[in-house]
């Protein structure tokens, strides 16, 4: 059974992930972003189901494409390099989903824009956090 300290750790990691995803969304979904129109042409795979931490496997598998889109952005739009930002997210995702269980991600039929993709995972984080608090 999860202890209160492990629940607290999970909550903090989810809050960190949430903040990172919201910061990326804020840098992209903005009228001052000169590459917004171009970025919206990229398609991302969405999870068929995302209700448990193991479903973060679906986010992990899309981190490389996410980094490629972020590389389009001007450096002044991101105070961290996309590679470092994605690396930070990857570390948190690996810790949260755990490496001992192998989960095959199932994707929805419809692909999504980067904004829809980020909003989906932001909602996921918020939903899990709300069950922990």
């Amino acid at each position: 059974a999860p202890t209160s300290s492990s629940t607290k750790k999970t909550q903090l990691q989810l809050e960190h992930l949430l903040l990172d995803l919201q910061m990326i969304l804020n840098g992209i979904n903005n009228y001052k972003n000169p590459k917004l129109t171009r970025m919206l042409t990229f398609k991302f795979y969405m999870p068929k189901k995302a209700t448990e931490l193991k479903h973060l496997q679906c986010l992990e598998e899309e981190l490389k494409p996410l980094e490629e889109v972020l590389n389009l952005a001007q450096s002044k739009n991101f105070h961290l390099r996309p590679r470092d930002l994605i690396s930070n997210i990857n570390v948190i995702v690996l810790e949260l989903k755990g490496s001992e269980t192998t989960f095959m991600c199932e994707y929805a039929d419809e692909t999504a824009t980067i904004v829809e993709f980020l909003n989906r995972w932001i909602t996921f984080c918020q939903s899990i956090i709300s069950t922990l608090t």
Epitope: L19, M23, G27, Y31, K32, P34, H79
Partner: antibody, heavy 120, light 111 residues
Framework: QVQLVESGGGVVQPGRSLRLSCAAS????????MHWVRQAPGKGLEWVTV????????YYADSVKGRFTISRDNSKNTLYLQMNSLRAEDTAVYYC?????????????WGQGTTVTVSS | DIVLTQTPLSSPVTLGQPASISCRSS???????????LSWLQQRPGQPPRLLIY???NRFSGVPDRFTGSGTGTDFTLKISRVEAGDVGVYYC????????FGQGTKVEIK
């Protein structure tokens, strides 16, 4: 002094069109992004649309997308808002506001506004 | 869209006394460039909006130091240290971290 002056408002029937203008003076118009923001009678502020300093990008609120078009003429220091298929809910005071995307001030200068009334 | 919720919606204050307005965002407003684009605007009766504070706490030129902005992440506050008659009007928080949105406004009036 730095000034934005809107014009072109008036009373118009639903479904008709109207074009608003915003004349800028006292600053280098061509380096500023420009917004239109509206305020319905007795209500709060609602962002409508923005255009980049060079006209290269424009974005719209969902409520006006496909009906309103923002444009600018940097040689005339003028911003425009073409409003088509007007609805009763477009009734508002329309303000133009400038923003230097690099300064981080946000919308630092606003016009006095022009009133649009959509009524049959 | 980012939703900004202001409280209170009305604030009757005594001249010379302080006033405080809160603005809560549905999303973190920190941009990937490290800045937080949260502004405060003042709209006096019959006038257009006027910029008071930008990036949470920076007073715009000509704004008296009676006006102070603070906050972080999702919670922001505008304080007027000593309310004067000319401060009467509606105050809006506004974010430009994503596409611009405004709070509903807080009406400051004299008791």
């Amino acid at each position: 002094q730095v000034q934005l002056v809107e014009s072109g408002g008036g009373v118009v029937q639903p479904g008709r069109s109207l074009r608003l203008s915003c004349a800028a003076s006292g600053f280098t118009f061509s380096i500023y992004g420009m917004h239109w923001v509206r305020q319905a009678p007795g209500k709060g502020l609602e962002w409508v649309t923005v255009i980049w300093y060079d006209g290269s990008n424009e974005y719209y609120a969902d409520s006006v997308k496909g009906r309103f078009t923002i444009s600018r003429d940097n040689s005339k220091n003028t911003l425009y808002l073409q409003m088509n298929s007007l609805r009763a809910e477009d009734t508002a005071v329309y303000y133009c506001a400038r923003e230097d995307f690099d300064s981080h001030y946000g919308m630092d200068v606003w016009g006095q506004g022009t009133t649009v009334t959509v009524s049959s | 869209d980012i939703v900004l919720t202001q409280t209170p919606l009305s604030s009757p204050v005594t001249l010379g006394q302080p006033a405080s307005i809160s603005c809560r965002s549905s999303h973190h407003l920190i941009h990937s460039d490290g800045n937080t684009y949260l502004s405060w605007l003042q709209q006096r009766p019959g006038q257009p909006p006027r910029l008071l504070i930008y990036k949470i706490s920076n007073r715009f030129s000509g704004v008296p130091d009676r006006f102070t902005g603070s906050g972080t992440g999702t919670d922001f506050t505008l304080k007027i240290s000593r309310v004067e008659a000319g401060d009467v009007g509606v105050y809006y928080c506004m974010q430009t971290t994503q596409f611009p949105t405004f709070g509903q406004g807080t009406k400051v009036e004299i008791k």
